[in-house]
Amino acid sequence: ESALITQQDLAPQQRAAPQQKRSSPSEGLCPPGHHISEDGRDCISCKYGQDYSTHWNDLLFCLRCTRCDSGEVELSPCTTTRNTVCQCEEGTFREEDSPEMCRKCRTGCPRGMVKVGDCTPWSDIECVHKESGTKHSGEVPAVEETVTSSPGTPASPCSLSG
């Protein structure tokens, strides 16, 4: 049996063809990059750049591709088998526990602390106490107590747990 050619295998100029590829379900499921027809007889390919499915499924529709928010950069585009990958812009981060938006990284550590970790798209700068080496997880000091590496940005709440 010949292999099913899915949308992600095609060159960009070939992807615009409106006809969606079809194949038969296997044990009632359709492969990644497809969804099942309403009558359950066919697997219909997702539309490149519009929707996707990542696993074997019995979805009646492929899932909508994510659009990156402002303040995010697109690391990789949506294909028929993988959603868009978005990442916070430089100087901002998104925590796993509060993932709704990218937050500005702090520009420096509170007085008496030293920076041991840089701002990354998934974490704020990391500060430790000079003497004890323990992470900062307490209240944010007043702005004038904050040692900054660039002027003008007040400290945001420190969210690193110790």
Partner: nanobody
């Protein structure tokens, strides 16, 4: 507080069946996708299956395709996993999980889930 309580695990022979349940004590259960993961001894936690908030459509890992069926009863805040044709390699602790954020229609990676049950052990051996 989100609480997820799995049950239904046990020891079964190869080729046998089990039905796992997961009772959720959270009001948003009926509006959220929910998933099953498993962790075998010495291995990483892996995706098994996930189901849409409305129960219409689900994802399955290739390793369980055609053998496992996920379902849910939103009126009872309960998730199910019907497992049949069980194999030795299905031996693991099975966890149900709710995603940490609501913007993914059907999350399927460990990091997308923030709320986990304590797990129920499934052992498949002759």
């Amino acid at each position: 507080e989100v609480q997820l309580l799995e049950s239904g695990g046990g020891e079964v022979q190869p080729g046998g069946s089990l039905r796992l349940s997961c009772a959720a004590s959270v009001s948003t259960f009926g509006t959220s996708p929910v998933g099953w993961f498993r962790q075998a001894p010495g291995k990483e936690r892996e995706f098994v299956s996930a189901i849409r908030w409305d129960g219409v459509g689900a994802y399955y890992a290739e390793s369980v395709k055609g053998r496992f069926t996920i379902s849910r009863d939103n009126a009872k805040n309960t998730l199910y996993l019907q497992m049949s044709s069980l194999r030795a390699e299905d031996t693991a602790v099975y966890y149900c999980a709710l995603p940490r954020r609501g913007d993914s229609e059907l999350p399927s990676t460990v990091k997308e889930y923030g709320y986990w049950g304590q797990g129920t052990l499934v052992t498949v051996k002759p």
